[in-house]
């Protein structure tokens, strides 16, 4: 005997109390697949969460974090406090990056500046709490007699006067 519930589409549930009639999901609930015997309660975006997408009868709500927080985990299951650039979040709150480290985002941890010398390069721009160092040419490239960092201007062809 065919299970009549299999005919119930997404957005409905198979109501055994009413001879397996497909009843619409009640407000604040959904069923994303057919043949369901119950509808799932919609996620509520409350507190530090705000609604990005409301629940429909066939899909759950989706949440974002309110201003000053960012999402963590699958489907934004948690909200974590933002810090400023140049800081990282610790158990005691937002703390400035230690010397030699930086964070260019509002989330995540402070990371060490790039060690230019490991690549045989020199520091072109010093690092800050918010920005990594910028590595430039190696010291040898900048020594007297070495070729310039910028290519020479091309020589004019004979017989052409300057513009």
């Amino acid at each position: 005997l065919q299970d009549l519930c299999s005919n119930c589409p997404a957005g409905t549930f198979c109501d055994n109390n009413r001879s397996q009639i497909c009843s619409p999901c009640p407000p604040n609930s959904f069923s994303s697949a057919g043949g369901q015997r119950t509808c799932d309660i919609c996620r509520q975006c409350k507190g530090v969460f705000k609604t990005r997408k409301e629940c429909s009868s066939t899909s759950n709500a989706e949440c974002d974090c309110i201003s000053g927080y960012h999402c963590l985990g699958a489907e934004c299951s948690m909200c974590e406090q933002d810090c400023k650039q140049g800081q990282e979040l610790t158990k005691k709150g937002c703390k400035d990056c230690c010397f030699g480290t930086f964070n260019d985002q509002k989330r995540g941890i402070c990371r060490p500046w790039t060690n230019c010398s490991l690549d045989g390069k020199s520091v072109l721009v010093n690092g800050t709490k918010e920005r990594d160092v910028v590595c430039g040419p190696s010291p040898a490239d900048l020594s007297p007699g070495a070729s310039s960092a910028t290519p020479p201007a091309p020589a004019r062809e004979p017989g052409h006067s300057p513009q």
Epitope: P26, P27, N28, R52, K53, C55, T58
Partner: antibody, heavy 116, light 107 residues
Framework: QVQLQQPGAELVKPGASVKLSCKAS????????INWVKQRPGQALEWIGN????????NYNGNFKSKATLTVDRSSSTAYMHLSSLTSKDSAVYYC?????????WGQGTTLTVSS | DILLTQSPAILSVSPGERVSFSCRAS??????IHWYHQRTNGSPRLLIK???ESISGIPSRFSGSGSGTDFTLSINSVESEDFADYYC?????????FGSGTKLEIK
């Protein structure tokens, strides 16, 4: 900021039909329900139904099932309510309002007058 | 359909007074009640959601309480801009329904 724009007024003859519009802006149209609410002069609010623009899910108040049809145009972020076989009892202010459960943003309302 | 009964139909108070509005549901609706006010010739505005949750941008003098069948909206010190019609709405089951409203007028 979130806005729901509705025409101020519509005048139609008895027996005719009308299509009321509600243009949404300031948010992702397909992510939030649009509800329609009727208010006759000096009377309480009456929920007509709602539509989810993301997938065209609809729910209707049984009193309006043969009167109102809800649709959306996703390309213009506009919700519509088609009212048929109009009589003087359909003369009212019709509001569109955003929200799945509590209605957090409302249009200014369209005053529908049914008169010959 | 769930019937929402609001009482009284009219409340007369002076500015600065505390006022409470009542909304009674015909069956248990948990906390699926929302409160609105509507000034003359204006659109309704959401004041409280889910019986007691505050709404961003709504003054803190508005508060809500209750669950099951009996709900209350309170204004702890009425201001001149609060004189309006007040409606409750349930979202526990289809169709959504509104109460008949309470008019808050100046005494």
């Amino acid at each position: 900021q979130v806005q729901l724009q509705q025409p101020g007024a519509e005048l139609v003859k008895p027996g005719a039909s009308v299509k009321l519009s509600c243009k949404a802006s300031g948010y992702t149209f397909t992510n939030f329900w649009i509800n329609w609410v009727k208010q006759r002069p000096g009377q309480a609010l009456e929920w007509i139904g709602n539509i989810y623009p993301g997938n065209d899910n609809t729910n209707y108040n049984g009193n309006f099932k043969s009167k109102a049809t809800l649709t959306v145009d996703r390309s213009s972020s506009t919700a519509y309510m088609h009212l048929s076989s109009l009589t003087s009892k359909d003369s009212a202010v019709y509001y569109c309002a955003r929200g799945q459960l509590g209605l957090d943003y409302w249009g200014q309302g369209t005053t529908l007058t049914v008169s010959s | 359909d769930i019937l929402l009964t609001q009482s009284p139909a009219i409340l007369s108070v002076s500015p600065g007074e505390r006022v409470s509005f009542s909304c009674r549901a015909s069956q248990n609706i948990g906390t699926a009640i929302h409160w609105y006010h509507q000034r003359t010739n204006g659109s309704p505005r959401l004041l409280i959601k889910f019986a007691s949750e505050s709404i961003s941008g709504i003054p803190s003098r508005f508060s809500g309480s209750g669950s099951g069948t009996d709900f209350t909206l309170s204004i702890n010190s009425v201001e001149s801009e609060d004189f309006a019609d007040y409606y409750c709405q349930q979202s526990n089951s289809w169709p959504f329904t509104f109460g008949s409203g309470t008019k808050l007028e100046i005494k």
